[in-house]
Every structure is written in structure tokens, then in C-alpha cells.
């Protein structure tokens, strides 16, 4: 699995809605694959982490002044929706096909 | 200044192009305000860090399993351009009014 020593990448993160208290309104699924972005943004930043110019600059400054400036951070750069069955205000079970921004599609250095 | 104990915010970061080796092609300015996103993404995530649903989920999972899952990360969510004077292929000094993605406009938790 991707630790701090490995480079920025998408790793598995199974989220159980009961664990985060969302089971009160999300009926199904009980859990889903959220994924997590893990790993370091090390110099040189590879193309696959789609660095912005600012991330490249920050990485270079960190290289020169590691105690003054942090590295860029490995974060979701593109998210995907999931489908959820939830209770509406009237308590009616309703399907939302595209509940946006719930699952990581891509990770990158920002 | 914003340390790890403070919440996610934009802080000053003056970047000297000579320090990062970009003075070989950027003639002016000699330095610029890049800004840096610093601080933690603590529960509950405030509106001003414009959290995605995934960031909210990850924050909740971190709260439940702090050793298994990391917090969301404080990163640039909007970048601004700067103007730079550079030498083109013929060595002609040329002004690029909008060199995109060089300076942080907004920080957020992702």
C-alpha cells in the first residue's frame, strides 16, 4: 500500500456509511469505494501527478528550503459520482444516480 | 504564520527565480508572491475551505480511524497568473501577460 515513502497514487478506501453517521439518511449502499490519495509529491514531479506550475514551483522551493516550505500535497484532482438510495424530506426512498464528488477518479500533486 | 495547528489558509511565499533555477529563462520579475496553502483540515470542515464531498467523507473516516486514514489536505483550489518577461527562441525579450497557475488565489481542503 502507498505510504509516505511511496509516490502519490490512488489507493483503496472502503467507507461504511454507518461509521461516518450517514446511515441515517443513506439507505444503500451500506459502503462504497471512496479511494484515497496517498504518497509523497517528490522531486521531480512526474507527469502522471499532473502538477500545476505552482506545485512545481513549491516543490523546487521545498528542495532548496525544506524547513521553510512544505512539499506539494497528494490530493484528488478528479472525482466521480456514486449512486445512492436515500430518504427524502418526506421519508420517501429516492434514487440519486449521480451523487457527485464522492469517489476519487484521479490523484495529483497540488 | 499558519502552522500545522492552525486551520487551512493562504500564507505568503516569496519565490526568487534564481533559487529555483528559473532565472535562466525568466528575466523579470526577479521574484514573485506565489503564496502557499498551510494549516490543517480539521473537523468540522468550514465553508471557507470549500470542501468536496470526498474531503468531508475522508475527514469523518479520519475522525473514526485516525491511524488508518489521513486528513484531507490544504491545497490551492484556485490559481492566478503572473506576468513574466522571458527570452524567446531568438533571444528576444518577450512579455507573457498571463503565465497561468503560478500564484495561489484560494486554498481549500481536498
Amino acid at each position: 500500500s502507498a505510504g509516505a515513502g511511496s509516490h502519490c497514487q490512488k489507493t483503496s478506501l472502503r467507507v461504511n456509511f454507518e461509521d461516518i453517521g450517514w446511515d441515517s439518511w443513506i439507505i444503500a449502499p451500506k459502503e462504497y469505494e471512496a479511494y484515497e490519495c496517498k504518497g509523497g509529491c517528490f522531486f521531480p514531479l512526474a507527469d502522471d501527478v499532473t502538477p500545476t506550475k505552482h506545485a512545481i514551483v513549491q516543490t523546487l522551493v521545498h528542495l532548496k528550503f525544506p524547513t521553510k516550505v512544505g512539499k506539494a500535497c497528494c490530493v484528488p484532482t478528479k472525482l466521480s459520482p456514486i449512486s445512492v438510495l436515500y430518504k427524502d424530506d418526506m421519508g420517501v426512498p429516492t434514487l440519486k444516480y449521480h451523487y457527485e464528488g464522492m469517489s476519487v477518479a484521479e490523484c495529483g500533486c497540488r | 504564520s499558519a502552522g500545522a495547528g492552525s486551520h487551512c489558509q493562504k500564507t505568503s511565499l516569496r519565490v526568487n527565480f534564481e533559487d529555483i533555477g528559473w532565472d535562466s529563462w525568466i528575466i523579470a520579475p526577479k521574484e514573485y508572491e506565489a503564496y502557499e496553502c498551510k494549516g490543517g483540515c480539521f473537523f468540522p470542515l468550514a465553508d471557507d475551505v470549500t470542501p468536496t464531498k470526498h474531503a468531508i467523507v475522508q475527514t469523518l473516516v479520519h475522525l473514526k480511524f485516525p491511524t488508518k486514514v489521513g486528513k484531507a489536505c490544504c491545497v490551492p483550489t484556485k490559481l492566478s497568473p503572473i506576468s513574466v518577461l522571458y527570452k524567446d527562441d531568438m533571444g528576444v525579450p518577450t512579455l507573457k501577460y498571463h503565465y497561468e497557475g503560478m500564484s495561489v488565489a484560494e486554498c481549500g481542503c481536498r
Epitope: - | K30, S83, V84, V92
Partner: antibody, heavy 119, light 111 residues
Amino acid sequence: EVQLVESRGGLVQPGGSMRLSCAASGFTFSNYWMNWVRQAPGKGLEWVAHIRLKSDNYATHYAESVRGRFTISRDDSKSSVYLQMNSLKTEDTGIYYCTGGSNYVFAFWGQGTLVTVSS
Amino acid sequence: DIVMTQSPDSLAVSLGERATINCRASESVDNYGISFMNWFQQKPGQPPKLLIYAASNQGSGVPDRFSGSGSGTDFTLTISSLQAEDVAVYFCQQSKEVPWTFGQGTKLEIK
């Protein structure tokens, strides 16, 4: 080697017209702003006009002293820039330099051509 | 228009000595942390040649004895050790705003 070669100038009467041309070589002409700068006899330099790039819709700008009388144009396929001068005045007399450059500087200069407006 | 004023109008300096030419703009020619100030050298019978750009950067093939400094409205061109071939007229020029304008020129001669 960069070269800018202006057409021969000459003598023209006040109120008359003249067209200058400038042929460029040694650089990618279409990538550079083109300008005309003039110098009255024994005097300083005065920017006359410039024409920008195709991506700028060939935008033109003129010095107040020539606006409405002079027209700058370019033909990227011929690597040439032109200055059409109408309603010439005696104060338009001088050496006319064709210059190429960026949005920041006059980088390349021709040798200049003398235009004399006199009766 | 931005008016560029040079001083002195003419200058006589001994060979090997330092020559200093000043240029003042009627308003700041700095923007985005960049100085929109250039210096040109014109020898008799020749077109101008770019000496210094962005206030302090040497043009291609320009000898190290030529240097520029300043920001905002006040700029200086310095020749550290005058050579015979430096006899010329020197012009400052701003490119911050159209119309791009030149100083009136400073004639440099050998004393």
C-alpha cells in the same frame, strides 16, 4: 542572420504620398510585431506605428502625429511590412527604420531609408 | 504619453573613465515587478542597437562594461571604462504604454 531591408525612400512634395516596404529574413516573421520608427535629421527617435500578430487580428497602433495619414500593413507570406504615407508634411522628413520585435522591445532594425518631404 | 527625459544632453569622458547617463520617466514604467525600460546605442550612420533591456539586462553581444540600473521613474546607464568605439548617441525608451517613447538622446564623446 537577421535582416530587414527597407525600400528606397526619396523626395516627395507636401501633400503627396509614398509607400515604404520592408523585407525581412533570418527569423520567423509571423511571430513578431513589426514597427516603423523615424528620425528627423539630427534629431531623436520617434515611434511611428506598429502591427501585431495574426493572433491579435493584426491590430495596429499609430503615433498621434501620423494617425489618419499613415497606414501600416503586413504580409506574412512575403515576410514583409509596409507603410503607406499620405498627406505628407515637411515634418515627416527623416530616416524611416523598419523594426521587428516583441510586445516588449524593438529587437531587429533595418538600415533605414530617407524620406524627404519638400517643395 | 509617457515623457522620457535624459540628462545630460551631451557628455565628454576620457578613455578608460566611467560614463553615466540618466533617464527620468514622467510616470513609473514598472508593472508586474518588471521595468519596461530599454537603452539603445546609435553610432553615426547606423541604426540603433539594443544595449540594455528591462532596466538592467544586457542585450546580445553587449560588452560587460555596459550596465543599467534603476526602477520606477529613474534609470541609469553606466559605461564602466569608456572605449573609443563607445562614441555614439544613447537613447532610453519605455515600452510600458503605447505610444512607446524615447528620450531625446545623450551624445557621448571622448574628452
